[in-house]
Each structure stands twice: as C-alpha cells, then as structure tokens.
Interface confidence: low
C-alpha cells in the first residue's frame, strides 16, 4: 500500500490522543533504554509503511501484536485517513485470523513495540531538512 495520500495530521492526532498511551501501557515496566532502536524511517509515508509492517506482520518470536489495543487503533486510523487502505487489508486480515496464536507478551514483542514507538516518534516529527 502506498501511504503517500494519507491525511498525516489526522493520523498524528490519533497517535497523540490514544495510540501513544496504549504503546506506553504495553511497555509499562520496561526501561526506556532497554532496547536500541534499529528500525528508522525517512519521511511520513515511509514511517507508516514500517509501522504497518511491524504492527501487523507476524515475526519470529512475536506473532501477537495485531490484536493489541494500539494495533487496533492504528488499523482504524489508517482505514479512516488513508484512502483505499481498508480494501488492501481484507485478504491480509483473513489470513491473520486463520493463524492467530495465543496472546503472549514476549521479550521479542516488547522489543518490537519499542521499535514501533521510535517509528511513531519519527512520523510525528519529520526530519529537519539538510541545508
């Protein structure tokens, strides 16, 4: 999906009002310095691409993020503010339902959500332009 035509300010508002708090809740009890940010993004469409990938694509050691509160709110925000996003997700959602596993908060998931926090931060403050 190409995130270029999303309403970035509306997505930012959704993040500030709720998603950020849900991410903090998920990470509660974890030191902010525990994980190094290894994933980054260079502009807002790129950030949303990385956010979608980390939030909704199961990875080795962390298959359970898609049903977390922050993930559901992320999905809702993208569906509302990114034209045509919902249609592209129908097949992916059906596939997810077939292989959904028991919800477990693993260290790998915590690390992945820490990366997500970094990506959202970058999304919310696009890089200063090089002069």
């Amino acid at each position: 999906y190409d995130f270029t035509n999303c309403d970035f300010e509306k997505i930012k508002a959704a993040y500030l009002s709720t998603i950020s708090k849900d991410l903090i809740t998920y990470m509660s009890g974890t030191k902010s310095t525990e994980f190094n940010n290894t994933v980054s993004c260079s502009n807002r469409p790129h950030c949303l691409t990385e956010i979608q990938s980390l939030t909704f694509n199961p990875t080795a050691g962390c298959a359970s993020l898609a049903k977390e509160m922050f993930a559901m709110k992320t999905k809702a925000a993208l569906a509302i503010w990114c034209p045509g996003y919902s249609e592209t997700q129908i097949n992916a959602t059906q596939a997810m339902k077939k292989r959904r596993k028991r919800k477990v908060t693993t260290n790998k998931c915590l690390e992945q959500v820490s990366q997500l926090q970094g990506l959202w931060r970058r999304f919310n403050r696009p890089l200063l332009k090089q002069q």
Epitope: L16, S20, I24, N37, R121, R125, L127, L128, K129, Q130
Partner: antibody
Framework: EVQLVQSGAEVKKPGASVKVSCKAS????????MNWVRQAPGQRLEWMGI????????SYNQKFKGRVTLTVDKSASTAYMELSSLRSEDTAVYYC??????????????WGQGTTVTVSS | EIVLTQSPATLSLSPGERATLSCRAS?????MHWYQQKPGQAPRPWIY???NLASGVPARFSGSGSGTSYTLTISRLEPEDFAVYYC????????FGGGTKVEIK
C-alpha cells in the same frame, strides 16, 4: 543516565570564531534533536538553532543565520556549535539541550552544564 | 517569529502565598513548556506540554492554557520555589519568553 557534557570556557577576540562541543551519553544520539541556547549575563534565554543528529538537518534562529553553524559527529555522539564574527554582545553562557519527543509535545529535557564564552579585546 | 511575553517580570511574594505566572504568545501555539532556572545553574524542565509536570516537580505546581494564553501556578510557595521561570514554544522555531523572577518579599 542521560548526560550532556560541554567543552570548557573560552576567551576570544572580536572578529574571531568559537566552537563549542557537547558530548552526549546515556541515550541513542540520533533519536533526538539537539538545541543550542545562549544566555548573556543577567539576560533571557535565547534560542540559536537546532540540529537532527540523524541526518544533520538544521534550523536556525534568523538572528544568527550566517554566523552560527551546527554540526554533529555521530560516531562520537557529539554536537558542535560554531559562532563566527564574534562581538562583545556574544559574551554569554552557551548551552546544548536535548529535545525529546514527549507524547504531548516537544521539550528540552536535558541540558549541558553550559560553556562560558567571553569576547573581549 | 512567535514572540512570547511573560508577566509580571518580577513577582514578590512570601512563602505560603499563591503565585500566578503568565505567558502570552503573539500567535496561537499548540503547547507551552516551562523551565526553572536558579542563579549559576542551567535551566531545568519544569512543565512539559502545557500541563505535564517534569520528573521530581512537586504537585503544588500546575500549568494550564491554550492558544495564546498560558499560565504556571504555584499553589503555596516554598522557599525552594524562588527562581526565574521561562516559558518556551516549539511551534515555530524554539522561542523563550523573557522570564518571570519569583522573589521573596
């Protein structure tokens, strides 16, 4: 623990340049912005500019544009502020200040100890 | 450029009294931050994003406001609260107000 350690005091002559360093530790240097703020004796805080260590992007206070240059050395986790064409009014304490992204806004959450720059003939 | 005007420049009060510090912006801003500075020290973050107290800041401090008008309130002044307080915005550049000095009467 986040720490910003600045270089020592400098005495310069009018027309010269000064370069102040700010060594960061305790966090991922490229994750946050670095601001430079100065304070003349008995005066208000004055923002000079901001740099993103991630890509070297900068934004300057128009008052200093052309005279101030902000740079970073990512490998050394160090930010630099160079001020040229010094005049007596540039005598001040110069601070580096990390700008974190709190989920409700930007703020300068950690400050260096300050570097005193004295410009005198 | 957004100009921040703090008033009063100096506030002379006694311990136990209530202090109200004002910061007005020349145009609307999203948030206001506040910093405390004592003589010979670097500024310390005091209130983030209008109303969030920084770590270690006592609950007698509070922040409020929106648009162009923001306020820092100290409900009951303690001896350690006497200092200079600066407001700062991040919407357009990073500008500071002129500061309000809270001094012992």
């Amino acid at each position: 623990e986040v720490q910003l350690v600045q270089s020592g005091a400098e005495v310069k002559k009018p027309g010269a340049s000064v370069k102040v360093s700010c060594k960061a530790s305790g966090y991922t240097f490229t994750d946050d912005y670095m601001n430079w703020v100065r304070q003349a004796p008995g005066q208000r805080l004055e923002w000079m500019g901001i740099i993103s260590p991630y890509n070297g992007g900068t934004s300057y206070n128009q008052k200093f544009k052309g005279r101030v240059t902000l740079t970073v050395d990512k490998s050394a986790s160090t930010a630099y502020m160079e001020l040229s064409s010094l005049r007596s009014e540039d005598t001040a304490v110069y601070y580096c200040a990390r700008e974190d992204y709190d989920y409700d806004g930007y703020a300068m959450d950690y400050w260096g100890q300050g570097t005193t720059v004295t410009v005198s003939s | 450029e957004i100009v921040l005007t703090q008033s009063p420049a100096t506030l002379s009060l006694s311990p136990g009294e209530r202090a109200t510090l004002s910061c007005r912006a020349s145009s609307s801003v999203s948030y206001m931050h506040w910093y405390q500075q004592k003589p010979g020290q670097a500024p310390r973050p005091w209130i983030y994003a209008t109303s969030n107290l920084a770590s270690g800041v006592p609950a007698r401090f509070s922040g409020s406001g929106s648009g162009t008008s923001y306020t820092l309130t100290i409900s009951r002044l303690e001896p350690e609260d006497f200092a200079v307080y600066y407001c700062q915005q991040s919407d357009s550049g990073r500008e500071f107000g002129g500061g309000t000095k809270v001094e012992i009467k």
